[in-house]
């Protein structure tokens, strides 16, 4: 008979295939983790449909200068479809994992610092555009909060533009028996000795791909164009459909670049819940669906993580 080990957290089964597996080009990837924390509302920032409050996350750029890189969308339910949307609105739940530990979990639940999806935005350079993603919250759910505290700075490459992107979040509160996510307890510490203890560690993955059946044109340099907004909305919805697990916290900074159309975005996951291989393979598995639903022919998928380490004390930026 086969060798059997006792299963961590107890044996559970589900009829759905929970792990998607597709090809990846092997990369030595390193992750950046940080605390998500809300700050004061930003005056004058543009909000998108479905939002009722826009908050900013302060990040430090690679040069060490403080840069405001995005919005936080709160849980204003909006079930109407976006004008011009080709599909149903993205389903967004604005809570992070529920306060009760899932059955079989070996650790306490993660505590969410904000009660809404957080935006982590890298701006684009002059050859590309980046604008607000239209996200509709169709469900509101309770989020856990921790006392307000000074946020830990974290760094992502900045391309010197001031067009922010709203994070599209799909952090769902789900039944552990159906998502089977109870096998990995929340991580509560960062990978860098100088960083503070984190109540919610997150990992950022930089994803890029080509849309080979589209040509880059000036409309994709201008976030105000319908073409830009529609393509960004389609890609946001695609991401939310692909990364359905509760540990996917959202996406940000969808950018378009020349070369057919090169799409770049940053995906945010709860730390310790996915590896660089699966981020890419899950996306790869849905290329066919993207082609049929959105008429997007996707190729040259690449995933790496936003470089680490960073220093919470010095604000050291991303190398290179």
């Amino acid at each position: 008979s086969g060798h059997t080990n006792s299963t961590p957290g107890g044996e559970k089964e589900t009829s759905a295939t929970q792990r998607s597996s597709m090809p990846i080009s092997t990369k030595n990837a390193v992750s950046m983790t940080s605390r998500l924390s809300s700050h004061s509302p930003v005056s004058g920032s543009s909000t998108t449909q479905g939002q009722d409050v826009t908050l900013a996350l302060a990040m430090e750029s690679a040069t060490g200068s403080a840069t405001t890189l995005g919005h936080v969308v709160t849980s204003a339910p909006d079930t109407s479809a976006a004008p011009g949307s080709t599909g149903p609105p993205a389903h967004v739940v604005t809570s992070a994992p529920d306060t009760s530990a899932a059955p079989g979990s070996t650790g306490p639940p993660a505590h969410v610092v904000t009660s809404a999806p957080d935006t982590v935005t890298s701006a684009s350079d002059s050859a590309s555009g980046s604008a607000s993603t239209l996200v509709h919250s169709t469900t509101s759910a309770r989020a856990t909060t921790t006392p307000a505290s000074k946020s830990t700075p974290f760094s992502i490459p900045s391309h010197h533009s001031d067009t922010p992107t709203t994070l599209a979040s799909h952090s769902t509160k789900t039944d552990a028996s159906s998502t089977h996510h109870s096998t990995v307890p929340p991580f509560t510490s960062s990978n860098h000795s100088t960083s503070p203890q984190l109540s919610l560690g997150v990992s950022f993955f930089f994803l890029s791909f080509h849309i080979s059946n589209l040509q880059f044109n000036s409309s994709l340099e201008d976030p105000s164009t319908n073409y830009y907004q529609q393509l960004q909305r389609d890609i946001s919805e695609l991401f939310l459909q692909i990364y359905k697990q509760g540990d996917f916290l959202g996406l940000s900074n969808i950018m378009f670049r020349p070369g057919s159309v090169v799409v770049q975005s940053t995906l945010v996951f709860r730390e310790g819940t996915t590896n660089v291989h699966d981020v890419e393979t899950q996306f790869n598995q849905r290329k066919t669906e993207a082609a049929s639903r959105y008429n997007l022919t996707i190729s040259d998928i690449s995933v790496r993580d936003v470089p680490f380490p960073f220093s919470a004390q010095t604000g050291a930026g991303v190398p290179g």
């Epitope: 998607s20 597996s21 998502t179 660089v276």
Partner: antibody, heavy 120, light 107 residues
């Protein structure tokens, strides 16, 4: 209870192919990724690749990419690993190992191993 | 590829000793580090995953620690049944490489 039962020992000549089976029971076969790992005599463990039986997608270690084929028969809840163009250095115990379910990054159950001897 | 280097390659200790095995990854693997125990003639057995989470049924004398590129398996009080070879595994990115193993013997 979960069990992974592998096929029996094989002796093959260089240049031949071998196909090792791994029958799974005690869980939903299509829900868990199945990996293959080998261990040469007195040596360490070497990851070869995996199959997701739910989607039939495979991913291989580049070292074996041209010689290994991993398949799955859902109806029989069995995974297979075929290695072609065998050489003497392929003599090893071959294990199937189940990866824990969603967000579970470890092998929680292993087969008992299948010794493949390549000798002329 | 991420290379995993274990040290020592073998060690001999007395019953009751505290034993430490280290595993170094060539790149940050973000706690996606697994430890297995393999006894002679047997299949590997899962001990620890996510660098520090003990599998149910594994004695509490086993513990894991570390982050980034450096990880440690500790046996707080060595028992005769712990004689085995211990392997670490990178589960951050493919190929899911293993360390070369640490053979643990009783003096």
């Amino acid at each position: 209870q979960v069990q992974l039962v592998q096929s029996g020992a094989e002796v093959k000549k260089p240049g031949a192919s071998v196909k090792v089976s791994c029958k799974a029971s005690g869980y939903t076969f299509t829900t868990y990724t199945m990996h293959w790992v080998r261990q040469a005599p007195g040596q360490g463990l070497e990851w070869m690749g995996y199959i997701n039986p739910g989607s039939d997608y495979t991913h291989y270690n580049q070292k074996f990419k041209d010689r290994v084929t991993i398949t799955a028969d859902k109806s029989a809840s069995t995974a297979y690993m075929e290695l072609s163009s065998l050489r003497s250095e392929d003599t090893a115990v071959y294990y199937c190992a189940r990866q824990g379910n969603y967000a579970a990054y470890y092998f929680d159950y292993w087969g008992q191993g299948t010794l493949v001897t390549v000798s002329s | 590829d991420i290379q995993m280097t274990q040290s020592p390659s073998s060690l001999s200790a007395s019953v009751g000793d505290r034993v430490t095995i280290t595993c170094r990854a060539s790149g940050n693997i973000h706690n996606f580090l697994v430890w297995y125990q393999q006894k002679p003639g047997k299949s590997p057995k899962l001990l620890i995953y996510n660098a520090k989470t003990l599998t149910s049924g594994v004695p509490s004398r086993f513990s894991g620690s570390g982050s980034g590129t450096q990880y440690t398996l500790t046996i707080s009080s060595l028992q005769p049944e712990d004689v085995a070879t211990y392997y670490c595994q990178n589960f951050w990115n493919v190929p899911f490489t293993f360390g070369q193993g640490t053979k643990l013997e009783i003096k």
